[in-house]
């Protein structure tokens, strides 16, 4: 699991590859702060609850965020 409690940032390794939006349980976007100087995106998968860190600079990940946001706006009244 690419997470660590010993460093200020949560993510150690990040992926440029998107996942299927439908396989996501949760998508957390953690803004840069005094504790971690970069934006972090943590995807929790429905299958096994596995967590993955995604690269916010990757175009494919930006496309994923757009797709998730569009999906959510469809669902909300």
């Amino acid at each position: 699991v690419p997470l660590s409690r010993t460093v200020r940032c949560t993510c150690i390794s990040i992926s440029n590859q998107p996942v299927n939006p439908r396989s996501l349980e949760k998508l957390e976007i953690i803004p840069a702060s005094q504790f971690c100087p970069r934006v972090e995106i943590i995807a929790t998968m429905k299958k096994k609850g596995e967590k993955r860190c995604l690269n916010p600079e990757s175009k494919a990940i930006k496309n994923l965020l757009k797709a998730v946001s569009k999906e959510r706006s469809k669902r909300s009244p």
């Epitope: 440029n16 998107p18 998968m45």
Partner: antibody, heavy 119, light 107 residues
Framework: EVQLVQSGAEVKKPGATVKISCKVS????????MHWVRQAPGKGLKWMGW????????TYADDFKGRFTFTLDTSTSTAYMELSSLRSEDTAVYYC????????????WGQGTTVTVSS | DIQMTQSPSSLSASVGDRVTITCKAD??????IAWYQQKPGKAPKLLLH???TLQPGIPSRFSGSGSGRDYTFTISSLQPEDIATYYC?????????FGQGTKLEIK
Amino acid sequence: EVQLVQSGAEVKKPGATVKISCKVSGYTFTDYSMHWVRQAPGKGLKWMGWINTEIGEPTYADDFKGRFTFTLDTSTSTAYMELSSLRSEDTAVYYCARNYDYDAYFDVWGQGTTVTVSS
Amino acid sequence: DIQMTQSPSSLSASVGDRVTITCKADQDINKYIAWYQQKPGKAPKLLLHHTSTLQPGIPSRFSGSGSGRDYTFTISSLQPEDIATYYCLQYDSLLFTFGQGTKLEIK
């Protein structure tokens, strides 16, 4: 040199199953997603979907849900596309294409595999 | 899904001519368009990405421009080896779409 080498041409009967391979070399297989594209005879390119090579999770375009299966063998750096219950309209050239996910376009393609479905 | 309308579907031009192909998206694709060249029996080859960025090794006679929904691919001086079919690809979405293709022939 980055290369995607696909398996050879296949001739199948309707109702059969075909499995195409795409073996990569020249880069770390799990660093890039792998996409599949279909081209029917005399027609244009149609995107079929992709597989996340880190976790082996496939995503299919709407027109390619059901009979299509994308899989991986990371030990041999090979992606596979399997198509079951073949029909004559599945006759096409199938391409694998590496996606440069950071920028999100297809930068390297396999040479294509011709699948002919005929009774 | 984002639809891409490519025109013309075929085009006949002479060596040395300036050739222009257009792709129109049904929504803003934020310049995330790539252009591919495909010769008969061969795989598509990437020429340009992000509207106008030329791939290494691709001749400078190939260029691209556009923004929003409208994009143009240009060959400034057509060469005999440019005879091929050209496709646009939008990648501003998780769901990719190609244009229908433009078959380029020599007069």
